[in-house]
């Protein structure tokens, strides 16, 4: 089948990194600089993506594969193929329309991107707070007070909703 196809269409013999040049008797010509063909049998090479402006090159374009971009330092990618760059914030912050803002009490963000999320409410699982939450870290839930033998607990049982370690009600 391959042989039949190549007899019918000489372009099918052109490998990735080349194109079937109609101006030169359909011979396989290498892709020109700043272009690529990722599959065989192509009649043109595609132009390489430029990683300029807020984008920077993560992977250079080659004759067989397109360039890949990421974002300049202090920014991270959004969208398919890194189609937008968004400013990083510090851990314990989230990006709002007014810039980076600290997480509100009862929420945390342990990354440089994304939004602040509520602390885990340990009491919903019948557990107690082992380690209090911060702006950068979620609470750590421990065994439920009932699981601990009397006198052995160093953990205070869940109390009013405003106590650190609980999501605001």
């Amino acid at each position: 089948f391959e042989r039949t196809r190549s007899l019918q269409d000489p372009c099918s013999n052109c490998p990735a990194g080349t194109f079937c040049d109609n101006n030169r008797n359909q011979i396989c010509s290498p892709c020109p600089p700043n272009s690529f063909s990722s599959a065989g049998g192509q009649r043109t090479c595609d132009i390489c993506r430029q990683c300029k402006g807020v984008f920077r090159t993560r992977k250079e374009c080659s004759s067989t594969s397109n360039a890949e971009c990421d974002c300049t330092p202090g920014f991270h990618c959004l969208g398919a193929g890194c189609s937008m760059c968004e400013q990083d914030c510090k851990q314990g912050q989230e990006l709002t329309k007014k810039g980076c803002k600290d997480c509100c009490f009862g929420t945390f963000n342990d990354q440089k991107r994304g939004i602040c999320r509520p602390w885990t409410n340990c009491s919903l699982d019948g557990k107690s707070v082992l380690v209090n939450g911060t702006k950068e870290r979620d609470v750590v839930c421990g065994p439920s007070p009932a699981d601990l033998s009397p006198g052995a607990s160093s953990v205070t049982p869940p109390a009013p909703a405003r106590e650190p370690g609980h999501s605001p009600q």
Partner: antibody, heavy 115, light 107 residues
């Protein structure tokens, strides 16, 4: 909220220099690329060029040689100068933030070139 | 430079109907394409980036699709505030270029 506010002379004579400034309020200034785009009356949009806080620039080859960008990081402002203007440069000029696409825009300034 | 071509130049649609706008690139631009809405006397507003991702605060009735050279912006049910001019823009390669725009008007 990120806001871009722009100003500059609205009426020029041929051969004069167009000068516009854009101030950025809210959000971060450094790290972003800041662009200028223009729109002739009743027509489409044309990218003029861009500058980053460090002063690095890029511009449309169709305007190269006539366009200059500058930045004042102490005021969170960037500026455009276009020299030797003609009637073909009559347009609404916009400043915008470049994050890949243009996600925030200034209100636009109509610049008319007429003798 | 990459030339962006939009069609139709004008689209007449009744409120509540679906609007489909097309944008074609002269060369493949993967999905590195944005759509903007512009109302008279206003600056353009970003609707879609990466060909299909809605920008912050953009209603779900706006959707983008396509890859390579053919792209579509669909407004599923036109509201009165959607009558405007829409532009596509590639940022795959410099210089950055825009399409000529599609005016969506009330039928």
């Amino acid at each position: 909220q990120v806001q871009l506010q722009q100003w500059g002379a609205g009426l020029l004579k041929p051969s004069e220099t167009l000068s516009l400034t854009c101030a950025v309020y809210g959000g971060s200034f450094s790290g972003y690329y800041w662009s200028w785009i223009r729109q002739p009356p009743g027509k489409g949009l044309e990218w003029i060029g861009e500058i980053i806080h460090s002063g690095s620039t890029d511009s449309n080859p169709s305007l190269k040689g006539r366009v200059t960008f500058s930045v004042d990081t102490s005021k969170n402002q960037f500026s455009l100068k276009l020299n030797s203007v003609t009637a073909a440069d009559t347009a609404v000029y916009y400043c915008a933030r470049l994050t890949g696409p243009f996600d925030y825009w200034g209100q636009g300034t109509l610049v008319t070139v007429s003798s | 430079e990459i030339v962006m071509t939009q069609s139709p130049a004008t689209l007449s649609v009744s409120p509540g109907e679906r609007a489909t706008l097309s944008c074609r690139a002269s060369q493949s631009i993967s999905s590195i394409l944005a759509w903007y809405q512009q109302k008279p006397g206003q600056a353009p507003r970003l609707l879609i980036y990466g060909a299909s991702t809605r920008a912050t605060g953009i209603p779900a009735r706006f959707s983008g699709s396509g890859s390579g050279t053919e792209f579509t912006l669909t407004i599923s049910s036109l509201q009165s505030e959607d009558f405007a001019v829409y532009y596509c823009q590639q940022y795959y390669n410099w210089p950055l270029t825009f399409g000529g725009g599609t005016k969506v008007e009330i039928k």
